[in-house]
């Protein structure tokens, strides 16, 4: 019996339900009654949903899941997960039998966006050119961890003295807070970006420095 | 009729491997699952794996996990179950059966092959 | 350590009912069917009963099974000295895998 589910991973966003699709091919003459069908998690083995004895045996994952019972006679066996969770990313395996069987396996993949960075500067007045300064970019509960990327305003990358830090909350979902130290010049806008790299959202933050007018000695 | 008859097993060493045969007939082998069931010397059936049709589909006792391996050659009609790493607790008959369907009972079952392991 | 739990005897006189109890929990019993098999001393394992209830062509009618919740039950009524035999119940198990009692000997006084 060919099981078939998405090669690529599901991307479901926090909070939102997600659909893990599986199907298989009913033979002439299928009922329901024949159907065996099992959602597990893969590597702990622990049951999620299952269908046996003509019956929708019910959700054994937190009360989150359903089928969709109107399509289970046409092949369709695919897992309904409400209100997802950081703790529900893994893998899935579907198993089917009716005469024979088969298995496959899903994987959902959990994202959630980065909130738009908040600049704040360190010192934050009196500033002249040749200052050393701290810039720091915070970005709130987003999933997975955020590639942090710093340039100037000519667009330039700034790599060197990069501080990134990141801090799972209760929930799973990421604060992250980036510095970076930088020697000012005359004028200089500082931007940061932090991505998101399942999602490919980028969220943007920047701080314009306006120095008080250059002086030599 | 519907007939499983098997071949492969003996005595080996522990640590030894073996093949274990089972020529099916009868039916057409490649609809249906089939399985493998151990019996220790005066002990209960344990069942070891099972594999789909296709063979594209396997699931092993956790017992036997990573040391068993269940294979099927359908333009045969032959199951196979390769056994490594042997150890003196797998000493046993072992069954080859066909499922009549999935989660419904075994219904055609091979002679027993033994498989004796010791030093 | 069999996952499915069965009493390890039971007897009967010829002509009497015998019934075999097999207890397993919500991820087998409770979610699939329960299959019977009897083995004749010295023979490979026979199915007996299958689908909780449903007896294989060739199976005398004194054979029935029944299932409620998490366990499953085989009654063998009118009792004849060839069921003298072992018997073993098996399922499904929502981890993927099949699970056997620990097996009931059945004697003829």
């Known amino acids: 019996l060919e099981v078939q589910v998405p090669e690529d991973p599901v991307v479901a966003l926090v909070g939102t339900d997600a659909t893990l699709c599986c199907s298989f091919s009913p033979e002439p003459g299928f009922s329901l009654a024949q159907l065996n069908l099992i959602w597990q998690l893969t590597d702990t083995k622990q049951l999620v949903h299952s269908f046996a004895e003509g019956q929708d045996q019910g959700s054994a994952y937190a009360n989150r899941t359903a089928l969709f019972p109107d399509l289970l006679a046409q092949g369709n066996a695919s897992l309904r997960l409400q209100r997802v969770r950081v703790a529900d990313e893994g893998s899935f395996t579907c198993f089917v039998s009716i005469r024979d069987f088969g298995s496959a396996a899903v994987s959902l993949q959990v994202a959630a966006p980065y909130s738009k960075p908040s600049m704040t500067l360190e010192p934050n007045k009196d500033l002249r050119p040749g200052d050393t300064v701290t810039i720091t970019c915070s970005s709130y509960r987003g999933y997975p961890e955020a590639e942090v990327f710093w340039q100037d305003g000519q667009g330039v990358p700034l790599t060197g003295n990069v501080t990134t830090s990141q801090m799972a909350n209760e929930q799973g979902l990421f604060d992250v807070h980036s510095v970076l130290r930088v020697v000012l010049g005359a004028n200089g806008t500082y931007s940061c970006l932090v991505r998101n790299p399942v999602l490919q959202q980028d969220a943007h933050g920047s701080v314009t420095i306006t120095g008080q007018p250059m002086t030599f000695p | 009729q519907v007939q499983l008859q098997q071949s492969g097993g003996g005595l080996v060493q522990p640590g030894g491997s073996l093949r274990l045969s089972c020529a099916a007939s009868?039916?057409?082998?490649?609809?249906?699952?089939m399985s493998w069931v151990r019996q220790a010397p005066g002990k209960g059936l344990e069942w070891v794996s099972v594999?789909?049709?296709?063979?594209?589909?396997?699931f092993y006792a956790d017992s036997v996990k990573g040391r068993f391996t269940i294979s099927r050659d359908n333009s045969k009609n032959t199951l196979y179950l390769q056994v490594n790493s042997l150890r003196a607790e797998d000493t046993a008959v072992y069954y080859c059966?066909?499922?009549?369907?999935?989660?419904?009972?075994?219904?055609?079952w091979g002679q027993g092959t033994t498989v004796t392991v010791s030093s | 350590q069999p996952v499915l739990t069965q009493p390890p005897s039971a007897s009967g006189t010829p002509g009497q009912r015998v019934t075999i109890s097999c207890s397993g929990s919500?991820?087998?019993?409770?979610?699939?069917?329960v299959n019977w098999y009897q083995q004749l001393p010295g023979t490979a394992p026979k199915l007996l009963i299958y689908?909780?209830?449903q007896r294989p062509s060739g199976v005398p009618d004194r054979f029935s099974g029944s299932k409620s919740g998490t366990s499953g039950s085989l009654a063998i009524s009118g009792l004849q000295s060839e069921d003298e035999a072992h018997y073993y119940c098996?399922?499904?198990?929502?981890?993927?895998?099949?699970?056997f009692g620990g097996g009931t000997k059945v004697t003829v006084l």
């Open positions: 919500s991820s087998n019993i409770g979610s699939n069917p």
């Open positions: 009868g039916f057409t082998f490649s609809s249906y699952p």
């Open positions: 098996a399922a499904w198990d929502v981890s993927l895998k099949e699970v």
């Open positions: 689908n909780n209830n």
């Open positions: 059966a066909k499922d009549g369907r999935t989660l419904s009972g075994m219904d055609v």
């Open positions: 594999i789909s049709g296709s063979g594209g589909s396997t």
